[in-house]
């Protein structure tokens, strides 16, 4: 079994989590990728996923989550904008590779969001940016129902996510367009 490691990100409300998940581009460039949250005692929940096959550098936005898959670089960029305290939790990037089990990328992310004014609103990049705009995109992202031989119960897929605009106030703890996806390592 792969040793699971966690990387802690401590950010303030209003800031942006910006994670770069690397992958072997020759193997996984066009594979569908997802961003999941892992709650204690539960299966990982998929919050957002890229299209299938994944489109190069095409942003997928689900509420305050933006995924960008850079095939040329073997890099999945995940951003969670306008962070809220309730977003705190354990997250991970995965690659869907049916019929095999999902492949976990990178370290798991332990996100801790605290209240308080951020000197760099909307970013965790130490104020080095001079341009940072979230484009008002609308993307339908259908995340697959993943069946694992080790999983006996499986939630049926709900409606496809169709959430737009950067100021969409979706509380990630109450996202309804979620599919439970088992991840084994």
């Amino acid at each position: 079994a792969t040793k699971l490691t966690e990387e802690k990100y401590e950010l303030k409300e209003g800031q942006t989590l910006d994670v770069k998940c690397d992958y072997t581009l020759e193997k996984f460039a066009s594979s569908q990728k997802a961003w999941q949250i892992i709650r204690d005692g539960e299966m990982p929940k998929t919050l957002a996923c890229t299209e299938r096959p994944s489109k190069n550098s095409h942003p997928v936005q689900v509420g305050r989550i933006i995924l960008e898959d850079y095939h040329d670089h073997g890099l999945l960029r995940v951003r969670m904008v306008n962070l809220q305290v309730e977003d705190s939790g354990l997250y991970q990037c995965v690659i869907y590779q049916p019929p095999k089990e999902p492949h976990m990328l990178f370290d798991r992310i332990r996100l801790v969001v605290t209240k308080g004014f951020s000197g760099t609103p909307g970013s965790n990049e130490n104020s080095t940016q001079n341009v940072y705009k979230i484009p008002p995109t609308t993307t339908k992202a259908l995340c697959p129902l993943y069946t694992s031989p080790r999983t006996v119960t499986q939630a049926p897929p709900k409606s496809t996510a169709d959430v737009s605009t950067p100021d969409s106030e979706i509380n990630l703890t109450n996202v309804t367009d979620i599919i439970r996806v088992p991840v084994f390592n």
């Epitope: 990387e7 802690k8 770069k20 690397d22 992958y23 190069n56 550098s57 850079y70 040329d72 670089h73 073997g74 890099l75 990178f106 370290d107 965790n124 990049e125 130490n126 080095t128 940016q129 001079n130 341009v131 940072y132 705009k133 484009p135």
Partner: antibody, heavy 116, light 107 residues
Framework: EVQLVESGGGLVQPGGSLRLSCAAS????????MSWVRQAPGKGLDWVAS????????YYVESVKGRFTISRDNAKNSLHLQMNSLRAEDTAVYYC?????????WGQGTLVTVSS | EIVMTQSPATLSVSPGERATLSCRAS??????LAWYQQKSGQAPRLLIY???IRATGIPARFSGSGSGTEFTLTISSLQSEDFAVYYC?????????FGGGTKVEIK
């Protein structure tokens, strides 16, 4: 084959300006972040600036903020670096590179010398 | 700003021997670390990204390891074309920062 060809370097006096250009080919320019990285003579590598495909995100190293401007023309597959108020410490080979975080492909570089 | 420190500054190795280069970050960069090779008079070339993933076309004798703040580039059996300067670079956060480099020279 990916090709990145820089131009526009040369000798300039302190306080002067230069505009570097980079002609890109062999890949889908409009789908890639692009950056400039520099290397002072006999020294190591220093990141200068990065720009997203649609220029919606631009980042600079602190020492060039307010003096340098990175831009791109996706229709012409070209990347630019406008350098104003140049200082002696800006003397370096400037590389045009593909990527916004790590750098998969590099040009051969163009030398910028700031001296009186 | 994340400071990257490489050691040693110079490494003298005989052809066919193993070379181990170290890179340390002043704070955790997770696995967002790349290694580059630069030969004299040439532009750098990406060797490793994601701390341990070989870039396209890079020989298997190059391997990377580590996570967080401590990273290693290993060249299992040095070939004549491997004598060069090697740089590590973090890309967890802007500003992107490089290490000062390790020169691998012939012993």
């Amino acid at each position: 084959e990916v090709q990145l060809v820089e131009s526009g370097g040369g000798l300039v006096q302190p306080g002067g300006s230069l505009r570097l250009s980079c002609a890109a080919s062999g890949f889908t320019f409009s789908s890639n972040w692009m950056s400039w990285v520099r290397q002072a003579p006999g020294k190591g590598l220093d990141w200068v600036a990065s720009i997203k495909q649609d220029a919606s995100e631009i980042y600079y190293v602190e020492s060039v903020k307010g003096r340098f401007t990175i831009s791109r023309d996706n229709a012409k597959n070209s990347l630019h670096l406008q350098m104003n108020s140049l200082r002696a410490e800006d003397t370096a080979v400037y590389y045009c590179v593909r990527g916004g975080w790590r750098f998969e492909s590099w040009g051969q570089g163009t030398l910028v010398t700031v001296s009186s | 700003e994340i400071v990257m420190t490489q050691s040693p500054a110079t490494l003298s190795v005989s052809p066919g021997e193993r070379a181990t280069l170290s890179c340390r970050a002043s704070q955790s960069v997770s696995s967002n670390l790349a290694w580059y090779q630069q030969k004299s008079g040439q532009a750098p070339r990406l060797l490793i990204y994601g701390a341990s993933i070989r870039a396209t076309g890079i020989p298997a004798r190059f391997s990377g390891s580590g996570s967080g703040t401590e990273f290693t580039l290993t060249i299992s059996s040095l070939q004549s074309e491997d004598f060069a300067v090697y740089y590590c670079q973090q890309y967890k956060n802007f500003p992107l920062t490089f290490g000062g480099g390790t020169k691998v020279e012939i012993k």
